[in-house]
Interface confidence: low
């Protein structure tokens, strides 16, 4: 239904707290360099204006679209050109082009320092002094570093943060209460960020149809007892919600997500038997819970997939009459039978099925042509299964850090032109797949591994798009989203690469490394490892292991030495010489 004032409508639906949080996220995601105070001031102005519209929908400017209202606010910021360069040109455009322009200027890798967590006492003091401002800072800092973070989910993580602080700040040992809990929230939020970025990439590059296919597969796996019409309705609604969030329409997105959660909870009987626990929770927790609810038990009496999609005499007729619906039902039927497959794999199978029908339905004897299609799925299924087995075996043998190093070597060989920080970030993220997925039961490993890897590789592609340096990466990133992971897996050593010269300073370290947190130490060592591979792309695993063991021993020795500086300055050059010899 049309509302006289869109901003009043959203304020009423969402309530002041969520309204303010979402406006803050929106501004922080668009203008990523502005300080919290600058954004907080704009948020207050927008909220005050929304309240005047709630009181009188006919008041001046209350009928304007949210894009117009928010865009005007952003464009009124002083020194916009000095701080944001060509983004200021967006302000010369009219809606909807102005909003599109803002979206195009979102930076996936802003040059902001890492979000450092203050120590426990300081955190608790500022939280107690002003919880609202404290949470505002959290929303601002996360949103500007992750400009596509799913806004209603970010409100959920802020709520989690709030609950943890409320609990832990009342304890004697605040540090040991806060650290593991906040680490857990951070890890989940980072995964949520890369997953959502993948959804927005899908929407931006391939449109709503591609995202809807993803949603049909995912929902069919989770709700195998829901019928196709129900799954289609949920997929359509979910597509709308994600389109809005990816497009910067955060108030509409959060409002529609709440509506979808309400619908699901009112229609549990036709969706899934597993929703009740989620539906008993308050809004943010409810929507989050529904998004990761466990799969419903599969119906026991599902007929073989071949009956409708291979053996039926009307296959080509059904396909010709309504291609999207027929392919949609295939994806639905296949996905509900395979919660053990990744969504990426299911979409590859649907694509293979579509290509087979396109070819075979034009031939003289279609059934003879498409009769073997299910058997032709086998290699497509085996490939990711082997990937999971090989990588989980390696992870179980090496542990997370060793596994990350193995991936780092592999990916540096595949794309040595990519910057070392990007390679290290990618390898560390890809390596976490072991901890995240390899401990799961067998039937959950494949979907966990492949869909997580796809999301991480999407980030690699986004970063590479900014400064393309590797033909290998460009090739894999140019294809469809579901083919990316197999493409990267199939890459081998880049034979066109001219090895980097050996620079001693790249492998020169100082005593300050000793006081770094473990994570930072690992990154330093991994940076050196990537540089070694760039110097000797064909070094054997054994050679690299020798050098890295030597390096670890050197750090251990010098960090325990009484005179660390002397140890580093005398032993460092010896280490460099030994490295060169080992790799000769």
């Amino acid at each position: 239904e049309a509302h006289k004032s869109e901003i009043a409508h959203r304020y009423n639906d969402l309530g002041e707290q969520h309204f303010k949080g979402l406006v803050l996220i929106a501004f922080s995601q668009y203008l990523q360099k502005c300080s919290y105070d600058e954004h907080a001031k704009l948020v207050q102005e927008v909220t005050d204006f929304a309240k005047t519209c709630v009181a009188d929908e006919s008041a001046a400017n209350c009928d304007k679209s949210l894009h117009t209202l928010f865009g005007d606010k952003l464009c009124a910021i002083p020194n916009l050109r000095e701080n944001y360069g060509e983004l200021a040109d967006c302000c010369t455009k009219q809606e909807p082009e102005r909003n599109e322009c803002f979206l195009q200027h979102k930076d996936d890798n802003p040059s902001l320092p890492p979000f450092e967590r203050p120590e426990a006492e300081a955190m608790c003091t500022s939280f107690k002094e002003n919880p609202t401002t404290f949470m505002g800072h959290y929303l601002h800092e996360v949103a500007r570093r992750h400009p596509y973070f799913y806004a209603p989910e970010l409100l959920y993580y802020a709520e989690q943060y709030n609950e943890i602080l409320t609990q832990c700040c009342a304890e004697a040992d605040k540090e040991s209460c806060l650290t593991p809990k906040l680490d857990g929230v951070k890890e989940k939020a980072l995964v949520s960020s890369v997953r959502q970025r993948m959804k927005c990439s899908s929407m931006q590059k391939f449109g709503e149809r591609a995202f809807k296919a993803w949603a049909v597969a995912r929902l069919s796996q989770t709700f195998p007892n829901a019928d196709f019409a129900e799954i289609t309705k949920l997929a359509t609604d979910l597509t709308k919600v994600n389109k809005e969030c990816c497009h910067g329409d955060l108030l509409e997105c959060a409002d529609d997500r709440a509506e979808l959660a309400k619908y699901m909870c009112e229609n549990q009987a036709t969706i899934s038997s597993k929703l009740q626990t989620c539906c008993d929770k308050p809004l943010l927790k409810k929507a989050h819970c529904l998004s990761e609810v466990e799969h419903d038990t599969m119906p026991a009496d599902l007929p073989a997939i071949a009956a409708d999609f291979v053996e039926d005499q009307e296959v080509c007729k059904n396909y010709a009459e309504a291609k999207d619906v027929f392919l949609g039902t295939f994806l639905y039927e296949y996905s509900r039978r395979h919660p053990d497959y990744s969504v990426s794999l299911l979409l590859r199978l649907a694509k293979k099925y579509e290509a087979t029908l396109e070819k075979c339905c034009a031939e003289a004897n279609p059934p003879a042509c498409y009769g073997t299609v299910l058997a032709e799925f086998q290699p497509l299924v085996e490939e990711p299964k082997n990937l999971v087995k090989t990588n989980c075996d390696l992870y179980e043998k090496l542990g997370e850090y060793g596994f990350q190093n193995a991936i780092l070597v592999r990916y540096t060989q595949k794309a040595p032109q990519v910057s070392t920080p990007t390679l290290v970030e990618a390898a560390r993220n890809l390596g976490r797949v072991g901890t995240k997925c390899c401990t799961l039961p067998e039937d959950q490993r494949l979907p966990c591994v492949e869909d997580y890897l796809s999301a991480i590789l999407n980030r690699v592609c986004l970063l590479h798009e900014k400064t393309p340096v590797s033909e290998h990466v460009t090739k894999c990133c140019s294809g469809s989203l579901v083919e990316r992971r197999p493409c990267f897996s199939a890459l081998t050593v880049d034979e066109t690469y001219v090895p980097k010269e050996f620079k001693a300073e790249t492998f020169t370290f100082h005593s300050d490394i000793c006081t770094l947190p473990e994570k930072e130490k690992q990154i330093k060592k991994q940076t050196a490892l990537a540089e070694l591979v760039k110097h000797k792309p064909k070094a054997t695993a054994e050679q690299l292991k020798t050098v890295m063991d030597d390096f670890a021993q050197f750090l251990d020795t010098c960090c325990k030495a009484a005179d660390k500086d002397t140890c580093f300055s005398t032993e460092g050059p010896n280490l460099v010489t030994r490295c060169k010899d080992a790799l000769a």
Epitope: P180, D183, G184, E187, K188, C392, Y395, E396, G399, E400, Y401, G434, T435, K436, C438, T439, L440, P441, E442, R445
Partner: nanobody, 114 residues
């Protein structure tokens, strides 16, 4: 070398409780997901529960959901399985394993019988 030592098994009546503990050494415990698996007399290995390296992600087999709780203490290199409302069908040798690997230890016998 890698060592895993389970303890805490025993004879318990149906409805009773036990706490199994697994002490790890010889590897960086905090870097690995861990699981509990069990083998009932004359049966194959059955996966029971798993926990991620940082303890944030816990999974259970349907047969034990709501009755068993897995936890870990990375500082003490210790994995725990709290078992409540035990049933005769829980009778088995329980092993702790790295990731989803195979048992490489003696295990601990749990017998549920009246």
């Amino acid at each position: 070398q890698v060592q895993l030592q389970e303890s805490g098994g025993g004879l318990v009546q149906p409805g009773g409780s036990l706490r199994l503990t697994c002490t790890a050494s010889g590897f960086t415990f905090r870097s690995f997901g861990m699981s509990w698996v069990r083998q009932a007399p004359g049966k194959g290995l059955e996966w029971v529960s798993a926990i991620s390296a940082d303890g944030s992600d816990k999974r259970y087999a349907d047969s034990v959901k709501g009755r068993f709780t897995i936890s870990r203490d990375n500082g003490k290199k210790m994995l725990t399985l709290d078992m409540n409302s035990l049933k005769p069908e829980d009778t088995a040798v329980y092993y702790c394993v790295i990731g989803r690997g195979s048992p490489a230890s003696q295990g601990t016998q749990v017998t549920v019988s009246s």
